[in-house]
Interface confidence: low
């Protein structure tokens, strides 16, 4: 019993003056609390609590359930306790069968004894099964049996409290241990799509999947740089014991341009946090942007191949593509394909393959594409470089020699005179007149050039060469010239 120091409040005194008291079932429990400032008696066992304002606690016929801690408290808040065991051979354990353990923490199997003098107070597996080898426990007759450092593997473990009574093993009712897993990693979060492109008024719906060991993981959708609470719906599943999945679906029923931005699905547990983002872009209407992959002005040599290539972005998906030349639509020689097979792809490539181009096939080649909202087009101007061709070479009635040549780029015509019958002419002759005949015509065809010289300048027999040339090549025509005789053209000769 506590000793009394005058002038200082002291705890109450209890009779009988023991810390523990053992009574038999059916006997009387009589406890007296002596204190001038007595307030109350309190009885506690498991989750049960009773109070008594009388300073003497009397239970006429004790039962096993009267086993527990009796505490007397005074007005100074000081208290004193006695633990009473009510020995009942038919009820050795008081039990609270709820048993939850947090992974890596200790948990109490609540099976306090009614008789402290029984032996071998311990835990046993149900149906004779052994307990896990690493399971350690500490018995306490007044509280139960403490399992140390609960493991995830103990989940759903069935066990009994056990004592030996008169050489026989007596088991309590069974307990099923439910283990609450500890978070040992951040949640795993994923999103249904990393980016969304929508038109105004369309529905935006995105699902975030959160996976963790238990349902106590926290998750939410947030808009970056905004505190606005977003409306989301949840579905969840337990796939086995420590495999929890939640789907958080964010929906904007009619998206607007100013809803565009980055949305973050955020999840955290006691270990840490994780997040994943998706980007929403809302456009007021669909679009098509076309980008040429080669210069839109193309020069190609006669007989060569060229590929006209465009890359384009189309949203919604392109519905109609075509390549056109001279109001004619190509049915083949072109291909159109998405740049990636990703479901959110908006980039496409179109290629027109022009083979063995002729001088007559220069012109404007146009790629057209449309979707449900817009049309777009891009034009390529194709110039076919051709070696000059001499179309005519004549002596005119006025004594002029005239040479007409066609090619692209525009040919240059030079004149040479060779004395005698040499066909290797070097002395150049200045033309009297040079004209480009069709410069006002279509810009893509061959350009025709006419050049004239005055034959009266020649005083000797010989050969006159008309040479037409450009960047691609050259062609010559020859005139045999006899002084004071008719000039007649020679067979066209191309070196």
């Amino acid at each position: 019993q506590p000793s009394v120091s005058p002038g200082e409040p002291s705890p109450p005194s209890i009779h009988p003056g023991k810390s523990d008291l053992i009574v038999r079932v059916g006997d009387e429990i009589r406890l007296l609390c002596t204190d001038p400032g007595f307030v109350k008696w309190t009885f506690e066992i498991l989750d049960e609590t009773n109070e008594n304002k009388q300073n003497e606690w009397i239970t006429e016929k004790a039962e096993a359930t009267n086993t527990g801690k009796y505490t007397c408290t005074n007005k100074h808040g000081l208290s004193n306790s006695i633990y009473v065991f009510v020995r009942d051979p038919a009820k050795l354990f008081l039990v609270d069968r709820s048993l939850y353990g947090k992974e890596d923490n200790d948990t109490l199997v609540r099976c306090p004894l009614t008789d402290p003098e029984v032996t071998n107070y311990s835990l046993k597996g149900c149906q004779g099964k052994p307990l896990p080898k690493d399971l350690r426990f500490i018995p306490d007759p007044k509280a139960g049996i403490m399992i140390k450092s609960v493991k995830r593997a103990y989940h759903r473990l069935c066990l009994h409290c056990s004592v030996d009574q008169e050489g026989k093993s007596v088991l309590s009712e069974k307990f099923i241990l439910k283990v609450r897993p500890a978070f040992k990693a951040v949640p795993v979060v994923s999103v249904s799509k990393a980016s969304y492109l929508l038109r105004e008024g369309e529905e935006f719906t995105v699902t975030c999947t959160i996976k963790d060991v238990s349902s106590s993981v926290y998750s939410t959708w947030k808009r970056e740089n905004s505190q606005t609470k977003l409306q989301e719906k949840y579905n969840s599943w337990h796939h086995g014991d420590f495999n929890y999945e939640r789907q958080a679906t964010l929906t904007i029923s009619s998206a607007r341009v100013n809803d565009s931005g980055v949305f973050m699905c955020y999840a955290n547990n006691t270990f840490g946090s994780a997040n994943v983002t998706t980007t929403l872009e809302v456009v007021d209407k669909g679009f098509i942007n076309i980008f040429p992959m080669i210069n839109t002005t193309v020069f190609v040599n006669d007989g060569e191949n060229v590929d006209l290539i465009v890359e384009y972005e189309a949203f919604p998906k392109p519905e109609h593509q075509q390549w056109i030349y001279m109001n004619r639509t190509f049915t083949d020689k072109w291909e159109d394909y998405p740049k990636s097979e990703n479901e959110s792809n908006i980039r496409y490539v179109s290629e027109l393959h022009l083979t063995r181009l002729k001088g007559t096939e220069g012109g404007t080649y146009t790629f057209l594409v449309s979707n449900s909202d817009v049309n777009a087009a891009i034009a390529f101007n194709v110039y076919v470089n051709t070696k000059p061709e001499i179309l005519t070479y004549d002596r005119l009635v006025n004594g002029m020699l005239q040479c007409v040549a066609a090619g692209f780029p525009e040919p240059t015509i030079d004149w040479y005179f060779c004395p005698g019958t040499e066909q290797r002419c070097s002395a150049s002759v200045l033309p009297v007149d040079v004209q480009t005949l069709n410069s006002s015509g279509p810009p893509f065809g061959k350009l025709v050039v006419q050049s004239s010289i005055d034959s009266s300048a020649f005083k000797h027999n010989g050969t006159v060469e008309c040479k037409a040339y450009n960047d691609v090549g050259k062609t010559s025509a020859y005139f045999n010239f006899a002084f004071k005789e008719q000039i007649h053209p020679h067979t066209l000769f191309t070196p």
Partner: antibody, heavy 122, light 106 residues
Framework: EVQLVESGGGLVQPGGSLRLSCAAS????????MAWVRQAPGKGLEWVAS????????YYLDSVRGRFTISRDNAKNSLYLQMNSLRAEDTAVYYC???????????????WGQGTTVTVSS | DIQMTQSPSSLSASVGDRVTITCRAS??????LNWYQQKPGKAPKLLIY???RLQSGVPSRFSGSGSGTDFTLTISSLQPEDFATYYC????????FGGGTKVEIK
């Protein structure tokens, strides 16, 4: 020669107004997208506003929307920026820029003026 | 809004060095990226548009690459006239510039 010349900058008190002008020459002004870009002392470039040549649509930086107005007069080959309720953070060199395009709707700024200085201070 | 982040903010290099500047967008901007050069007291000058297309009159030692969110400007052999500040700019949703990279003489 393609040229853009800005004018109208100066010192103004917070809350005051200024009107910047940009005179264009050497190209067909009405065919081009135009924009204003600014640069605070010792800082980087910041797009402020732009105007589409075909639709007349205007676009603004969030922090200037409602205070600044971009406009153009194609007959005078001129671009304007009316700046009201000026703040200290609007202090910058303001450049006028021409937008050229690649593809069908993708713009970049290929010609810039030399800039005009706006100082907002009490 | 789309944020553009340039790195490094400054670098020192010598004539003849190969210089690489990176630009990262806060969300995908496809290939809608331009690069500008600015010298002190001067207006910016367009170098590259649509990620890799060289503006007329710009020397071929300048090149650009990338797509989506990550882009690079490379100067293959730095010349004395290349010491300047370089800015990237996105054109996907309106316009925004990176913070700039100052290329200084070592």
């Amino acid at each position: 020669e393609v040229q853009l010349v800005e004018s109208g900058g100066g010192l103004v008190q917070p809350g005051g107004s200024l009107r910047l002008s940009c005179a264009a020459s050497g190209f067909t002004f009405s065919d081009y997208y135009m924009a204003w870009v600014r640069q605070a002392p010792g800082k980087g470039l910041e797009w402020v506003a732009s105007i589409n040549q075909n639709t007349g649509s205007t676009y603004y930086l969030d922090s200037v929307r409602g205070r600044f107005t971009i406009s153009r007069d194609n007959a005078k080959n001129s671009l304007y920026l009316q700046m009201n309720s000026l703040r200290a953070e609007d202090t910058a060199v303001y450049y006028c820029a021409r937008g050229d395009y690649y593809g069908t709707t993708y713009w970049y700024f290929d010609v810039w003026g030399q800039g005009t200085t706006v100082t907002v201070s009490s | 809004d789309i944020q553009m982040t340039q790195s490094p903010s400054s670098l020192s290099a010598s004539v003849g060095d190969r210089v690489t500047i990176t630009c990262r967008a806060s969300q995908s901007i496809s290939s809608y990226l331009n690069w500008y050069q600015q010298k002190p007291g001067k207006a910016p000058k367009l170098l590259i548009y649509y990620t890799s297309r060289l503006q007329s009159g710009v020397p071929s030692r300048f090149s650009g690459s990338g797509s989506g969110t990550d882009f690079t400007l490379t100067i293959s052999s730095l010349q004395p006239e290349d010491f300047a500040t370089y800015y990237c700019q996105q054109g996907r949703r309106l316009w925004s510039f990176g913070g700039g990279t100052k290329v200084e003489i070592k």
